[in-house]
């Protein structure tokens, strides 16, 4: 019993002595935040110079305050103990840790690409000024039917399934959370529509083939014989929709 008491006292003395010797060995540990330690002077703790800070204390130098310039604006002024905090000017929003970048806002129904704000492709929507276009909810996956069609700005609204449309049932189900783009039924529907259009074109072409004069026929054949090429993008592309490719990344102004 007496031995354990002795051990506790000894440990306490050791800890207190360590604290004291730590102060003597490393006087910099006595400097608070807002100061830096200069061992070459008698008063080793000096206040941080203007436009600099130290948030921890015991530091050999003070850090230069962040300056919120250009597209950045000051949310919190720099003090001797804490760095300035920035946010973005109107029309831009913060990206990255501590708002390290400002990204341009787009309108609802658009997303930001390398070439600026682009309208959401058919079958996708964005209800915010930031972020990417997401596919509409597929109501049929939940056995529902589309009650309100989707737009570039709004997701579809799912209603009861056709089987549920009895006089008593009239509940409207909010759309399920947006799914990750993949081989969703919207894309399948899109390709079906595309195939139908192609067939119609083929039908139209065959009709033409037997009804036009030779010169006209040659001209039409020339058009269809051209190899398929991606259309060259024009500089003014505000109304072009943005179908994102995996390598596309968010644009941003770095600090």
């Amino acid at each position: 019993m007496g031995n354990s008491c002795y051990n506790i006292v000894a440990t306490l003395l050791l800890v207190l002595n360590f604290e004291r010797t730590r102060s003597l060995q490393d006087p910099c540990s006595n400097c608070p935040a807002g100061t830096f330690c200069d061992n070459n002077r008698n008063q080793i703790c000096s206040p941080c110079p203007p436009n600099s800070f130290s948030s921890a204390g015991g530091q050999r130098t003070c850090d230069i305050c962040r300056q919120c310039k250009g597209v950045f604006r000051t949310r919190k002024e720099c003090s001797s103990t804490s760095n300035a905090e920035c946010d973005c000017t109107p029309g831009f929003h913060c990206l990255g840790a501590g708002c390290s970048m400002c990204e341009q806002d787009c309108k609802q129904g658009q997303e930001l690409t390398k070439k600026g704000c682009k309208d959401c492709c058919f079958g996708t929507f964005n209800d915010q000024k930031r972020g990417i276009c997401r596919p509409w909810t597929n109501c049929s996956l939940d056995g529902k039917s589309v009650l309100v069609n989707g737009t570039k700005e709004r997701d579809v609204v799912c209603g009861p399934s056709p089987a549920d449309l009895s006089p008593g049932a009239s509940s409207v189900t909010p759309p399920a959370p947006a799914r990750e783009p993949g081989h969703s039924p919207q894309i399948i529907s899109f390709f079906l529509a595309l195939t139908s259009t192609a067939l119609l074109f083929l039908l139209f072409f065959l009709t033409l083939r037997f009804s036009v004069v030779k010169r006209g026929r040659k001209k039409l054949l020339y058009i269809f014989k051209q190899p398929f090429m991606r259309p060259v993008q024009t500089t003014q592309e505000e109304d072009g929709c943005s179908c994102r490719f995996p390598e596309e990344e968010e644009g941003g102004c770095e600090l």
């Epitope: 540990s29 006595n30 608070p32 807002g34 002077r41 008063q43 080793i44 204390g57 001797s80």
Partner: antibody, heavy 120, light 113 residues
């Protein structure tokens, strides 16, 4: 031992600037910041600002930025504080002070104080 | 600026009595890096400059009698005089020693009954 010797009491007219001194001895003058503190009769203490004698870098309390000017003369190891356009509000005892050791460890060394009376 | 609030503004005591006075800061004076609280206590007698009693909230200045004890952390601090002597009658000031501008409390006046 560390000593801070201040100039004597001053009676001045409103608007006439006043300069008070603080002579340091017994330690390395350029090694420690000199602080100035104001105390109005029967009131608390107010920190005016501080000066680094090694390079004359000053830090002033915003409240006193248009009122006090801090200077030093290294050759005579003396710190000065000048008060501009004094009013009755500036009637007070002004102290110079120095930190104990490391800095930010309390003012262990004080001058005896200089009484400034502003009166018409 | 950090505002220092002392209470009570005055205390009437008898010799030998234990006394405690409070000092509260509007912001924490605790430096997390070294676990030190940057608060100082001073004693001031009429016609004299303040005298440092306690620094870093609880470290007694050399030559200060051990009846004076500083305690507390963060924003709440206390100065205790275990057994008041007649020579202890004075005004006691607490001071933020953590960030500029350095600020003082209005003081607690210790008077004899």
């Amino acid at each position: 031992q560390v000593q801070l010797q201040q100039s004597g009491p001053q009676l001045i007219r409103p608007g006439a600037s006043v300069k008070i001194s603080c002579k340091a001895s017994g330690y390395s003058f350029t090694g420690y910041w000199i602080h100035w503190v104001k105390q109005r009769p029967g009131q608390g203490l107010e920190w005016i600002g501080m000066i680094d004698p090694s390079d004359s870098e000053t830090r002033l309390n915003q409240k006193f930025k248009d009122k006090a000017t801090l200077t030093v003369d290294k050759s005579s190891t003396t710190a000065y504080m000048q008060l501009s356009s004094p009013t009755s509000e500036d009637s007070a005892v002004f102290y110079c002070a120095r930190y104990r050791n490391y800095g930010y460890d309390g003012f262990a060394h004080w001058g005896q104080g200089t009484l400034v009376t502003v009166s018409a | 600026d950090i505002v220092m609030t002392q209470s009570p503004s005055s205390l009437t005591v008898t010799a030998g009595e234990k006394v405690t006075m409070s000092c509260k800061s509007s912001q924490s004076l605790l430096n997390s890096g070294n676990e030190k609280n940057y608060l100082a206590w001073y004693q001031q007698k009429p016609g004299q400059p303040p005298k440092l009693l306690i620094y870093w909230a609880s470290t007694r200045e050399s030559g200060v009698p051990d009846r004076f004890t500083g305690s507390g952390s963060g924003t709440d601090f206390t100065l205790t005089i275990s057994s008041v002597q007649t020579e202890d009658l004075a005004v006691y000031h607490c001071q933020n020693d953590y960030s500029l501008p350095l600020t003082f409390g209005a003081g607690t006046k210790l008077e004899l009954k």
